[in-house]
């Protein structure tokens, strides 16, 4: 996250971190004691899933393996269209006020809703520097029509925009996947912005969760 | 292959302006930088700016602030670069060339920072 | 605005000679930012290494780069007929600079 803030202790105990032995892989979100949300992109061959601490590394929050995860099928590495994927822990959370599953989306937030979004990705750039602490930048819903002056075509149907007009904050490498929540639901996962991160005026880019919860829901059912 | 192809060159009178299309093909347009370099007679490079073509956001060199404007049209995948308020020591050779990766996407925070990629020039001569 | 500083200006040299060209910046460089390319009479640049160190995509492997701060090298280990050319250093730090280009010519 460029020019945010550290986020209040336990503000957000559906985020999760997505390791990749003990290495920041990704952000996500906890939608199930047995499911994980996050960007297609962040798609490894196993996952280690740390839960419940603001804290990268913490030797005291939950971790757990998944060996499984279920990327959209309409997901196009080439357009970042439907980025997003369900990853399914080997064994279930233990539900605690650290660790809750987030709301899912009943419609879709309009343009201008007040939203914070959340992640361990680098504070800096180009030079890279990973917090070790949960970073927030609160940011605001952009309309698509707003935002496709920026992007153009690479604007997807199902891409969400946010940022603050004039400001550097937004997110970064090793946000992907965590969440964008308003009015305490899910809206968006981190996808892809500009690079090097954080030039004001070019919003960051989300998954829009709001369109997807019937396939979240599906895909769980389906291997439950 | 890839490839950056550059429109033909030009002869302008002092006061006028310029402008040199850099059309790319091969690869994905909007996923990488368009820097413009010149280069007068028997001189180095000159870096003037560069364009992300995936926002339009653009980054002129001091000199050149004021004068030069860097656009894009995605839809067929070119870069436009129009100098202002010509002189004759603006003679040179413009080159476009295929900077870094413009947007970031996925867990990885190092890019590659080099012009890997030219256009053939475009020869600008500015005389009365 | 950083300021990179080529020397020599010319270096003149036999084939199967070893070249060492250097480039000094007015401020402190990443290496992740620092890039040689090579340019002939009438063609455009070519990448050679990017990263300081890094070289690009079919450079061959008399080339190399080095350094870090202030300080950086190219390195040609053996000089073929077609490397003589003009050298050039480039950095990046927010905008990018050039530095003013080595002649590698024929002794």
């Known amino acids: 996250i460029i020019d945010g803030y550290k986020c209040k202790e336990g503000s957000h105990p559906w985020q999760v971190a997505l390791l990749k032995g003990n290495q920041l892989h990704c952000g996500g979100v906890l939608v199930d004691k047995y499911w994980v949300l996050t960007a297609a992109h962040c798609k490894m061959g196993q996952y280690q899933v740390q839960l419940g601490s603001d804290k990268i590394g913490d030797q005291s929050a939950q971790k757990i393996k998944a060996t499984k995860s279920f990327r959209h099928p309409g997901y196009s590495t080439k357009t970042h269209v439907n980025d997003i994927m369900l990853v399914r822990l080997d064994e279930p959370v233990k539900m605690s006020s650290k660790v809750e599953a987030v709301q899912l989306p009943e419609h879709c937030e309009p343009p201008g809703t007040s939203c914070t979004v959340s992640g361990w990705g680098t504070t800096t750039s180009p030079d890279v520097t990973f917090p070790s602490d949960l970073m927030c930048s609160d940011v605001k819903l952009i309309s698509s029509r707003e935002c496709k002056k920026v992007y153009k075509d690479l604007l997807g149907k199902t891409m969400l925009c946010a940022g603050i007009p004039d400001s550097k904050t937004n997110t970064c490498n090793g946000d992907s996947g965590g969440p964008l929540v308003c009015n305490d639901t899910l809206q968006g996962l981190v996808s892809w912005g500009t690079y090097p991160c954080g030039q004001p005026n070019d919003p960051g880019v989300y998954t829009q969760v709001c369109k997807y919860k019937r396939w979240v829901m599906e895909t769980m059912k389906t291997h439950r | 292959q890839v490839q950056l192809v550059q429109s033909g060159a030009e002869v302008k009178k002092p006061g006028a302006s310029v402008k040199v299309s850099c059309k790319a093909s091969?690869?994905?347009?909007?996923?990488?930088?368009m820097h413009w370099v010149r280069q007068a007679p028997g001189q180095g490079l000159e870096w003037m700016g560069s364009i992300n073509p995936s926002s339009g956001g653009t980054n002129y060199a001091q000199k050149f602030q004021g004068r030069v404007t860097m656009t894009r049209d995605t839809s067929i995948s070119t870069a436009y670069m129009e100098l202002s308020r010509l002189r004759s020591d603006d003679t040179a050779v413009y080159y476009c060339?295929?900077?870094?990766?413009?947007?970031?996407?996925?867990?990885?925070?190092?890019?590659?920072?080099?012009?890997?990629?030219w256009g053939q020039g475009t020869t600008v001569t500015v005389s009365s | 605005e950083i300021v990179l500083t080529q020397s020599p200006g010319t270096l003149s040299l036999s084939p199967g000679e070893r070249a060492t060209l250097s480039c000094r910046a007015s401020?402190?460089?990443?290496?992740?930012?620092l890039a040689w390319y090579q340019q002939k009479p009438g063609q455009a640049p070519r990448l050679l290494i990017y990263?300081?160190?890094s070289r690009a995509t079919g450079i061959p492997d008399r080339f190399s780069g080095s350094g870090s701060g202030t300080d950086f090298t190219l390195t040609i280990s053996r000089l073929e007929p077609e490397d003589f050319a003009v050298y050039y250093c480039?950095?990046?730090?927010?905008?990018?600079?050039f530095g003013g280009g080595t002649k590698v010519e024929i002794k």
């Open positions: 060339a295929r900077g870094g990766p413009s947007t970031w996407y996925g867990g990885s925070a190092y890019y590659y920072y080099g012009m890997d990629v």
């Open positions: 990263g300081a160190s």
């Open positions: 480039q950095q990046y730090a927010n905008l990018w600079t």
């Open positions: 401020q402190s460089v990443s290496s992740d930012y």
């Open positions: 091969g690869y994905t347009f909007t996923g990488y930088y």
